[in-house]
Structures are given as C-alpha cells and as structure tokens.
C-alpha cells in the first residue's frame, strides 16, 4: 500500500550512546521526505523531524524525559512536493522502529581516567562523571546520577614493566588499590552494568600511565 | 499482575445510554493507550475505540462514531466508554484491553454483556 | 478499511500435530499484525504481536510469521489445552479490524 513513488523506510536502527539517541533508517529519499514519530506506550505520537530528507534523526530530547519507559519510533514516507498526499488506505506509508528501554539498552561511552594520585604504595584512581544529556530540576544529570548502583566500573593494571593485569571494580567512580613501591603502572577503566541483557559493558578507556602529566605522586 | 475489570454492562431499550468502566490496576495505568473490543453473541472480535495514556488522541470505529465516547480518568485508573442511542446491533460482550503504543492488545478484561432490546 | 481473511474457518487436528493457520490482509501491512487465543465463554489472550514477537509468559511452540499481505500462526506440537479460537488483527490503520476467526477443535 501506500503513495505511487514513496517506498517505506526500512532498516530502522537505534543508535544510542549514554543517552544521545538517533534513529537511522534506509533508503536515502528520492522525490520523498520523511516524519518521524516517537512514543512511549501511551500512544501519545509526538512528530520530529518534519518532512526531512536526512535518513537520521536526533531523538535525545524525547527519550530522556524518561530513560526508563520503552520507546517505539516510526518513520513517514511522503511524496516530495506533495506532503498531504496519502496511500491508497488514506494514510501515508510508514515503518516502525524496534522498541528501544534507554535505561536497558544505551551503550555505555568510552570512559575517561580523570585522574590518579599514589601515596606510598596504595594509588587512588578517578574515572570521569561523565555529563548525560538526561536533565532533572534543569540541571545535566552524570552518568553515575542516572544509572546508580546499577553501574559498576572495572581497572584494568599493570606494571609498565610486564603484562600480567589485574582487575578491580567499584560501584562509585573511585578505586584505592596497592601497587609496589617504585613500580610504574598502566591503568585502563571499563563502564560495566552487570544487571544488563545487553550493552553490558563500554569499551576500555584510553590507557594511562604513572609518570605521565595525569598522575601525582606523594610519599 | 495486570487486572482489568469491566462493569456497567446490561439491558437497555434501544435509542438509550449506557456508561461502561473499566478499573485497572497492576501497572502504570497513564503509560498506556487502552482500548474497547466488542463480541456480538456467537461472533468475532470487533476493535471499538482505543484512547491514548494522555487522552488527547482518541480513535472509533465508523459505526460507532458520533454514539460512543471513550474517556479515561488515570486519577482513577479507569477506562469509560459511553455509549449513546444504543442500537440492537450494539448487543455485545464489551472488553477493555491495555494497548501499548495504541497498537494490539496485550492484557484484557473479563468483559461485560450490553444488552440492547426492547 | 483494511480486510483480514483468516483460512481455514475451522480446523480439527489432534494433540502433538504441527498446525498452521494463516491470515491475509487486503493490503499490505508490513508487520504490523498480533495473534490471540480466545477459549469459550473466555476473553482473548495474546499470543503474538508484531507478526512474529512472542507475548510474555507464552509458550514457544506458538510462532508467527510473515509480513505485508500473507501471515502465518504456527502450533508446532498441539497440546489439549491449545484447542480454541484464533483470530488475527490489524493495526497499521483505524479502523483496527480483525480476522473471523479459525476454531480449532479436536480429532
């Protein structure tokens, strides 16, 4: 069914990173445009992205109203030029997405070692807080705010002498761990929500070393 | 455990009123569009009316258009349908369903019997 | 309004058999079609959505299949308690409409 020259997108995809969430979708339009629509369960169809020629469109706005409802998105194909034109049902032709829980299902972003400190032989390690673009009261909620106890982070260390790693984890952004005196070592961090189905883990952060500008180095 | 619960149901002379409920509980009930089925004695399914969480959007079939109104109050959690200038065709068991995304129909009633007839 | 044709009307089949009840649509639909059991006297239950996604809490041996015009339930083994009503539905576009049914009845 559907408009004579319009063909419905297809390959609907979500791509979601620690909330910044488009939706992507095929063909590239000839003589048509798009609408895009998101819903949760409610049925309460908001449009986005109106009459557009682009095969994305940026959805962040709406899903972090609330990460943790599941959202369904569908894509209009309309005739270039004719926009009011519909199919032979009356309707325009459409495609809908897979559902999407952003709270189950965004990947978790690289991670950033902000900082580590060594004292004697223990070295404290701080990951990053990044900043989501899920808002509460009008400010910017980090990644730890939305996600809690639900989100675990894994070091990954070495000494810069050998390759034999080990790990720790933690359920804040902070890890104290022991190190031999007069030893450099290398640290790598990785996001983890162990509770998750999928989109369980980031990937590794960039690797830092002591002896490099990150680091300090008491007595 | 989704429950919905329909009452109101009953025997009205044609070109009469009924107001049907239908009380929800076991989820959140303004995260989700419902709806109304109907089944004549002995016949199909036959889609009514569904409504978004909101109730902004509400959607009928033709020959009800004009006769029925689907409400909801999410205060109360329940779901109504009044139904005006009933008609002998209207006789039907009436099914309130939970309908995500308004689309099919995945938790419903028990259903309750109107009766048009004189 | 879209029409949903459900063939057979009825079927009588016996318990462990492979079942297939199929359901076309007027027009296409891409996939947007859900399955439901109804047993007498009860309401309808879900089975599918989706053309092919699996209610909660229902049994594997319930499939479905298809997209645009032609769709396919599908019991692969028959248990005593599956023997009932099977309608499908529409709902790429109001007025949702469903098939008459197809009442599948012991051998």
């Known amino acids: 069914s559907g408009t004579t020259n319009t063909v419905a997108a297809y390959n609907l995809t979500w791509k979601s990173t620690n909330f910044k969430t488009i939706l992507e979708w095929e063909p590239k339009p000839v003589n048509q445009v798009y609408t895009v629509q998101i819903s949760t369960k409610s049925g309460d169809w908001k449009s986005k992205c109106f009459y557009t020629t682009d095969t994305e469109c940026d959805l962040t706005d709406e899903i972090v109203k609330d990460v943790k409802q599941t959202y369904l998105a569908r894509v209009f194909s309309y005739p270039a030029g004719n926009v009011e034109s519909t199919g032979s049902a009356g309707e325009p032709l459409y495609e809908n997405s897979p559902e999407f829980t952003p709270y189950l299902e965004t990947n978790l972003g690289q991670p950033t070692i902000q900082s580590f400190e060594q004292v004697g032989t223990k070295v404290n390690v701080t990951v990053e807080d990044e900043r989501t673009l899920v808002r509460r009261n009008n400010t910017f909620l980090s990644l730890r705010d939305v996600f809690g106890k639900d989100l675990i982070y894994t070091l990954y260390y070495w000494k810069s002498s050998s390759s034999g790693k080990k790990t720790a984890k933690t359920h804040t952004n902070e890890f104290l761990i022991d190190v031999d005196k007069g030893e450099n070592y290398c640290f790598s961090v990785q996001a983890v929500i162990p509770s998750r189905k999928v989109n369980r883990k980031s990937t590794d952060s960039p690797v830092e070393c002591m002896g490099q500008e990150k680091g300090e180095f008491r007595e | 455990e989704v429950q919905l619960l329909e009452s109101g149901g009953g025997l009205v002379q044609p070109g009469g009123s009924l107001r049907l409920s239908c009380a929800a509980s076991?989820?959140?009930?303004?995260?989700?569009?419902m709806s109304w089925v109907r089944q004549a004695p002995g016949k199909g399914l036959e889609w009514v009316s569904s409504?978004?969480?909101?109730?902004?959007?509400?959607y009928y079939t033709d020959s009800v258009k004009g006769r029925f109104t689907i409400s909801r109050d999410n205060s109360k959690n329940t779901l109504y349908l009044q139904m005006n200038s009933l008609r002998a065709e209207d006789t039907a068991v009436y099914y309130c369903a939970r309908s995500p995304w308004g689309y099919y129909l995945d938790s419903w009633g028990q259903g309750t019997l109107v009766t048009v007839s004189s | 309004d879209i029409q949903m044709t459900q063939s057979p009307p009825s079927l009588s089949a016996s318990a462990g058999d492979r079942v297939t009840i199929t359901c076309r649509a007027s027009?296409?639909?891409?996939?947007?079609l859900a399955w439901y059991q109804q047993k007498p006297e009860k309401a309808p239950k879900s089975l599918i959505y989706a053309a092919s996604s699996l209610q909660s809490g229902v049994p594997s041996r319930f499939s479905g299949s298809g997209s645009g015009t032609d769709f396919t339930l599908t019991i692969s083994s028959l248990q005593p308690e599956d023997f009932a009503t099977y309608y499908c539905?529409?709902?790429?576009?109001?007025?949702?409409?469903f098939g008459q049914g197809t009442k599948l009845e012991i051998k």
């Open positions: 076991g989820f959140t009930f303004s995260n989700y569009a």
């Open positions: 409504i978004s969480g909101s109730g902004d959007y509400t």
């Open positions: 027009q296409g639909i891409s996939s947007r």
């Open positions: 539905q529409q709902y790429n576009s109001y007025p949702y409409t």
